[in-house]
Interface confidence: low
């Protein structure tokens, strides 16, 4: 089949890194600078992606593969192939339309990206709060009071966390 296809389409012989040049009797020409072809038999080479502005080059473009970008410090990738860079926030914050804002009471974010998520509701699993949540950390659930049999060492929840964070109560 491959031999048959080659007889029918001379371009199929052109390897990655080249293109089938119609202007030169369909001979295989190397991709020009700043372009690439990642598969054989291509009639054109694709323009290399340029990592500009908030993007920075993670992998240089070659004749057979596109450049790969990531984001400059303070930003992180979003989308397939890092198609966008989004501003980092601190732990305990989320990115809003008005910039980085502290997580509100009852929510937390332990990463520099993403949104503030609600604390775990321990009571849904029949448990109690062992360690209170903060804007950077979820609550830690512990055994319910009923699980602590008489004579067993009881767990006393600590006083509510009051480290700088963000709490609208």
């Amino acid at each position: 089949f491959e031999r048959t296809r080659s007889l029918q389409d001379p371009c199929s012989n052109c390897p990655a890194g080249t293109f089938c040049d119609n202007n030169r009797n369909q001979i295989c020409s190397p991709c020009p600078p700043n372009s690439f072809s990642s598969a054989g038999g291509q009639r054109t080479c694709d323009i290399c992606r340029q990592c500009k502005g908030v993007f920075r080059t993670r992998k240089e473009c070659s004749s057979t593969s596109n450049a790969e970008c990531d984001c400059t410090p303070g930003f992180h990738c979003l989308g397939a192939g890092c198609s966008m860079c989004e501003q980092d926030c601190k732990q305990g914050q989320e990115l809003t339309k008005k910039g980085c804002k502290d997580c509100c009471f009852g929510t937390f974010n332990d990463q520099k990206r993403g949104i503030c998520r609600p604390w775990t509701n321990c009571s849904l699993d029949g448990k109690s709060v062992l360690v209170n949540g903060t804007k950077e950390r979820d609550v830690v659930c512990g055994p319910s009071p009923a699980d602590l049999s008489p004579g067993a060492s009881s767990v006393t929840p600590p006083a509510p966390a009051r480290e700088p964070g963000h709490s609208p109560q």
Partner: antibody, heavy 121, light 106 residues
């Protein structure tokens, strides 16, 4: 329509305690945070502390730490603020205020009518 | 602990613009709320999340927040705007109010 109805005015002696209640109606009580804010005569607003009933976790301003206790009773949709070791400087109007916990960011969207606490010997 | 600083008073002629400031360290990272309080009444939310206006608040009331200063702006001031205005943020799990600004309409 959400309403926060507070208990009536109180006159207390120095060194005693006062417990003010705040009954909520017209909303899902446990899903919101309730704060207590006080205002001394001719002075500004001062946040004392608050609680999210669903978590039962209370947080307090450092100034009131150890002297204020905020609790909530989900069965009656009522929040309570107890202030102990009263002194004359605690004479103020005490407000409860609801914070919409299911929206971001949080702000006080509904307020009680206020409870005047007078501390006098 | 976090502190918010407001001018104690501001006097503005009717029809002019009042700008009430609220200063705080990197206040930009916080969501600033503004409340209006008239004598004998509970406070009323007039701006949330820096610049969002609750329903019923006129368009001439606006808010902004950048750097170390948040600002409440009331354009075309009316006699009914005379009140105390408080900014408020959350710092950690603690609510913080500014000292309040008494707006007088001349």
């Amino acid at each position: 329509q959400v309403q926060l109805v507070q208990s009536g005015a109180e006159v207390k002696k120095p060194g005693s305690s006062v417990k003010v209640s705040c009954k909520a109606s017209g909303g899902t009580f446990s899903s919101y945070a309730i704060s207590w804010v006080r205002q001394a005569p001719g002075q500004g607003l001062e946040w004392m502390g608050g609680i999210i009933p669903i978590f039962g976790t209370a947080n307090y301003a450092q100034k009131f730490q150890g002297r204020v206790t905020i609790t909530a009773d989900e069965s009656t949709s009522t929040a309570y603020m107890e202030l102990s070791s009263l002194r004359s400087e605690d004479t103020a109007v005490y407000y409860c205020a609801r914070v919409g916990r299911l929206e971001r960011p949080y702000y006080f969207d509904y307020w009680g009518q206020g409870t005047l606490v007078t501390v006098s010997s | 602990s976090y502190e918010l600083t407001q001018p104690p008073s501001l006097s503005v002629a009717p029809g002019k613009t009042a700008r009430i400031t609220c200063g705080g360290d990197n206040i930009r990272s916080k969501s600033v709320n503004w409340y209006q309080q008239k004598p004998g009444q509970a406070p009323l939310l007039v701006i949330s999340f820096d610049s969002d206006r609750p329903s019923g608040i006129p368009e001439r009331v606006s808010g902004s927040n950048s750097g170390n200063t948040a600002t409440l702006t009331i354009s075309t001031v009316e006699a009914g705007d005379e009140a105390d205005y408080y900014c408020q943020v959350w710092d950690g799990y603690v609510g913080v109010f500014g000292g309040g600004t008494q707006l007088t309409v001349l």
